[in-house]
C-alpha cells in the first residue's frame, strides 16, 4: 500500500475553508484534480476546486461585494436619512409654532375673532405643511383663502359689530370686496411673495435630501453582473484552489477589478458632485425671505399689521362696502380700534431660547459641510472598497488572479486574463437601468436646485424693492427681523429652539435593507419621534 500523500498534496485546508461556506464536503476533491471543467479559476496544474465550488465562490463573492458597498455607504446613508427626518420634523415644529404665534396674536388683540380666526389660521398652516411635504397646492390660493375668510369676520365683528344677523349672508360679497378694494393693502401680496419663496426652497431642500437617500439606496442594492462575480471570484477565491489560503490579492489588481465592477456606479460621480454643490448653493441662499423659519415665525406680525391697515381705513371701507354689498346699517360705524401698545403682547409672543442654541440654518450648514466630505464618494468607491478588504501591502508577494507574484504588473495581469474575458468589455456595457434612472433623477433635482438658488447679497433687497415692498434694515446676523413693515415688528433671537433630541429623529427600521422579517415593525415609530 503506498504511503499517504503529504498534507500539502491533499485538499485538506481548502476543504475546511469551504466547509464554512457550504456545509457538507461532497463538492470538494479529496486530492488535487485536473479541473478541466473550471470556467473561472482556470488551473495551471492540479486544483482543489470543482465547478460547483466555483459557483458557490461566485455567489459568495457577489454577496461579499454587496456587503462591502453597503458598509461603505453606511455613514453617508445615516447622515442623510437622519437629517431628512430631523429637518422634516423641525419644519413641522416651525409651522406649529407659527400657527401658535398667530393664534396668540388673535387671542390677545382680537378676542372677538378667535373662534373663526383659529379655524382659518389652522387651515392655512395645514396647507403650509402639506405644501412642504410635496402636495400640489398653490401658495397664492392659500394666502388668498386666508384673507378671503378673515375679512368677513373682521368686517362683521370689528368694523361693523352692530350688523344684524340677517345681514350675515353678505359674506360672499365681502370675500369679493376684499380683493376688489384691496382692503388689506399690499400685505397679502407681501405674504404671498415671502411664503411662496421660503416654502418653495424648503420643499426642494427636503425633496433633495429624500433623493439623496434614494441614490444611496439604489447603489446600496445593486446586483453585480456575472462578469463582475467572476472577476471577484478570481481575485478573492481562486488562490484557494491552489491551496494558497493566506495569500492576499495585489492592491493594484484589486483597484482594476473594482473599477471594472463599479464602472456603472462611478458614472453617478459627476451628478453626485453637482448635487452636493447645488444643495450647498441652495442652503447658502436660505435666509431672510428664503428662510421659512424666519418668514413663518414672523407671519403673525404681518397679519396683525394687515388688520391694523384695515382698521385705519375702516371709515372709508365701511361706506364703500355698505353700498357695494347693500346691507342696511343698523347703527353708525364704530371702529373697534385699539391703542397701539395693546397690539403686541411681548410675554405671549416671546420665543423661549437658550444662548448659543442651534438654529435650523446652522444645522443646514453643518449638514452641507458633512456632505461635502462625501463629494468624491462615488469616484472613491473602488479605492475605498479595496482598502476595506484584504489586500497585500505594497503589492509584494500577492495574488494577481492567476498566481502568486513578487510584484503586481497590470500588463501581465491583463495578458493573463485575455482568454478569460475582457475587462474593457465589462466597462463598456454602460450603467445598469436603475443607475441610469437615478442619474436622470439627479439631473432633474440638480436642475431644480440651480433654478431655485438664491440671488446673493444686495440683489435680494433689490428684487424685493422692485416688487414694491419695504426690504427693511434687518441684518444677516442671528437676530433676524420677524414680520413685515409697521410698528408691530419684533425681534426674536434664534427663532426656533432647535432641540438636541431632534438630531436623532431617525426611524432606521423603515429604511430599506433591513432583513429582520419576524419583527413586528411595519409602520413602527422611532422613540426619537415621540
Amino acid at each position: 500500500q503506498p504511503p499517504p500523500p503529504p498534507p500539502d498534496a491533499t485538499c485538506h485546508q481548502v476543504r475546511s475553508f469551504f466547509q464554512r461556506l457550504q456545509p457538507g464536503l461532497k463538492w470538494v476533491p479529496e486530492t488535487p484534480v485536473p479541473g478541466s471543467d473550471l470556467q473561472v479559476c482556470l488551473p495551471k496544474g492540479p486544483t482543489c476546486c470543482s465547478r460547483k465550488m466555483e459557483e458557490k465562490y461566485q455567489l459568495t463573492a457577489r454577496l461579499n461585494m454587496e456587503q462591502l458597498l453597503q458598509s461603505a455607504s453606511m455613514e453617508l446613508k445615516f447622515l442623510i436619512i437622519q437629517n431628512a427626518a430631523v429637518f422634516q420634523e423641525a419644519f413641522e415644529i416651525v409651522v406649529r409654532h407659527a400657527k401658535n404665534y398667530t393664534n396668540a396674536m388673535f387671542k390677545n388683540n382680537y378676542p372677538s375673532l378667535t373662534p373663526q380666526a383659529f379655524e382659518f389660521v389652522g387651515e392655512f398652516f395645514t396647507d403650509v405643511s402639506l405644501y412642504i411635504l410635496g402636495s400640489d397646492i398653490n401658495v397664492d390660493d392659500m394666502v388668498n383663502e386666508l384673507f378671503d375668510s378673515l375679512f368677513p369676520v373682521i368686517y362683521t365683528q370689528l368694523m361693523n359689530p352692530g350688523l344684524p344677523d340677517s345681514a350675515l349672508d353678505i359674506n360672499e360679497c365681502l370675500r369679493g370686496a376684499r380683493r376688489d378694494l384691496k382692503v388689506f393693502g399690499n400685505f397679502p401680496k407681501l405674504i404671498m411673495t415671502q411664503v411662496s419663496k421660503s416654502l418653495q426652497v424648503t420643499r426642494i431642500f427636503l425633496q433633495a435630501l429624500n433623493l439623496g437617500i434614494e441614490v444611496i439606496n439604489t447603489t446600496d442594492h445593486l446586483k453585480f453582473s456575472k462578469d463582475c462575480g467572476r472577476m471577484l471570484t478570481r481575485m478573492w477565491y481562486c488562490s484557494y484552489c491552489q491551496g494558497l489560503m493566506m495569500v492576499k490579492p495585489c492592491g493594484g489588481y484589486c483597484n482594476v477589478v473594482m473599477q471594472g465592477c463599479m464602472a456603472g456606479v462611478v458614472e453617478i460621480d459627476k451628478y453626485w458632485r453637482e448635487y452636493i454643490l447645488s444643495l450647498e448653493e441652495l442652503v447658502n441662499g436660505m435666509y431672510r425671505i428664503y428662510d421659512m423659519e424666519n418668514v413663518l415665525l414672523g407671519l403673525f406680525s404681518t397679519i396683525h399689521d394687515s388688520i391694523q391697515y384695515v382698521q385705519k381705513n375702516a371709515g372709508k371701507l365701511t361706506t364703500t362696502i355698505g353700498k357695494l354689498c347693500a346691507h342696511s346699517q343698523q347703527r353708525q360705524y364704530r371702529s373697534a380700534y385699539y391703542p397701539e401698545d395693546l397690539f403686541i403682547d411681548k410675554k405671549v409672543l416671546k420665543v423661549a431660547h437658550v444662548e448659543h442654541e442651534e438654529t435650523l440654518s446652522s444645522r443646514r450648514r453643518e449638514l452641507i459641510q458633512k456632505l461635502k466630505s462625501f463629494i468624491s464618494f462615488y469616484s472613491a468607491l473602488p479605492g475605498y472598497i479595496c482598502s476595506h478588504s484584504p489586500v497585500a501591502e505594497n503589492d509584494t508577494l500577492c495574488w494577481n488572479g492567476q498566481e502568486l507574484v513578487e510584484r503586481y504588473s497590470q500588463k501581465a495581469a491583463r495578458n493573463g486574463m485575455k482568454n478569460q474575458f475582457n475587462l474593457h468589455e465589462l466597462k463598456m456595457k454602460g450603467p445598469e437601468p436603475v443607475v441610469s434612472q437615478i442619474i436622470d433623477k439627479l439631473k432633474h433635482i440638480n436642475q431644480l436646485l440651480r433654478t431655485m438658488s438664491m440671488p446673493k447679497g444686495r440683489v435680494l433687497d433689490k428684487n424685493l424693492d422692485e416688487e414694491g415692498f419695504e426690504s427693511g434694515d434687518c441684518g444677516d446676523d442671528e437676530d433676524e427681523c420677524i414680520g413685515g413693515s409697521g410698528d408691530g415688528m419684533i425681534k426674536v433671537k434664534n427663532q426656533l429652539r432647535f432641540l438636541a433630541e431632534l438630531a436623532y429623529d431617525l426611524d432606521v427600521d423603515d429604511a430599506p435593507g433591513n432583513s429582520q422579517q419576524a419583527t413586528p415593525k411595519d409602520n413602527e415609530i422611532s422613540t426619537f419621534h415621540n
Epitope: Y504, V508, T519, P520, K521
Partner: antibody
Framework: QVQLQQSGAELVRPGASVKLSCKAL????????MHWVKQTPVHGLEWIGA????????AYNQKFKGKATLTADKFSSTGYMELSSLTSEDSAVYYC????????WGQGTLVTVSA | DVVMTQTPLSLPVSLGDQASISCRSS???????????LQWYLQKPGQSPKLLIY???NRFSGVPDRFSGSGSGTDFILKISRVEAEDLGVYFC?????????FGGGTKLEIK
Amino acid sequence: QVQLQQSGAELVRPGASVKLSCKALGYTFTDYEMHWVKQTPVHGLEWIGAIHPGSGGTAYNQKFKGKATLTADKFSSTGYMELSSLTSEDSAVYYCTRYYSYAYWGQGTLVTVSA
Amino acid sequence: DVVMTQTPLSLPVSLGDQASISCRSSQSLVHSNGNTYLQWYLQKPGQSPKLLIYKVSNRFSGVPDRFSGSGSGTDFILKISRVEAEDLGVYFCFQSIHVPYTFGGGTKLEIK
C-alpha cells in the same frame, strides 16, 4: 437568531456606580434602538430609556435622567447602561430589549444595592 | 406620563376557560400615522417578558391563536379563548407612543 446577552448579577455598595452590558447577536446592531427596562416588585416594569446605536441618539424617562446613562459600542455590538449614586431604591432586575415592540429581551441583570 | 391601568389585578381561572384582561390608558394611543401602539406581554416566574400582541391586535410569530387583542383609543382587551397551563403568569400591557413609555401594573393569571 436574535439574542440579547446581559452581564451577570451585581452586588454593589450604596453611593457606588455600576455598568451593565447587553451584547446583541443575530441582527445589525446599528439598525435597531436598544431600550432598557427596570423591574421591581413595588413599581413593576418601568421604561428607563433608549439609545439608537447607529446615531448615538438617546431618549430618557425624566425619572431616570441623571441616574442612568446609556451608551453603545458599535464595534462590539454591545449596549451599556451605567447607574450612578446607587441607593436601595435601585435594587431591581434590569432588562435590555430590542425595539420595535420589544420582541426580544435580554435575560435580565439583578442589581442588589446593599451595605 | 401616560398611566396604564390594568384590571383585574389577579384572575383565577380553570384550565379551558376563557380569560379576559382589560387595560385602559390615560391618553389616546393612536398615532398620527393611524397606528395604535399598544402591546401585551406575558412574564413567567424567573423569565423575561415575552411579546404576545403588538399594535393592539397583531399576534407575534409563534404565539398561539387562542390569544387575541382588541380595543381602540384608550380601552384595550386581551382575550385567551381556552386557558392552558403554559399561559399562567403575569400579563402586562405597554404603550410605546408617548415618551416615557409605560407599562400596566400587571394581571396575574392563576389556577382557581
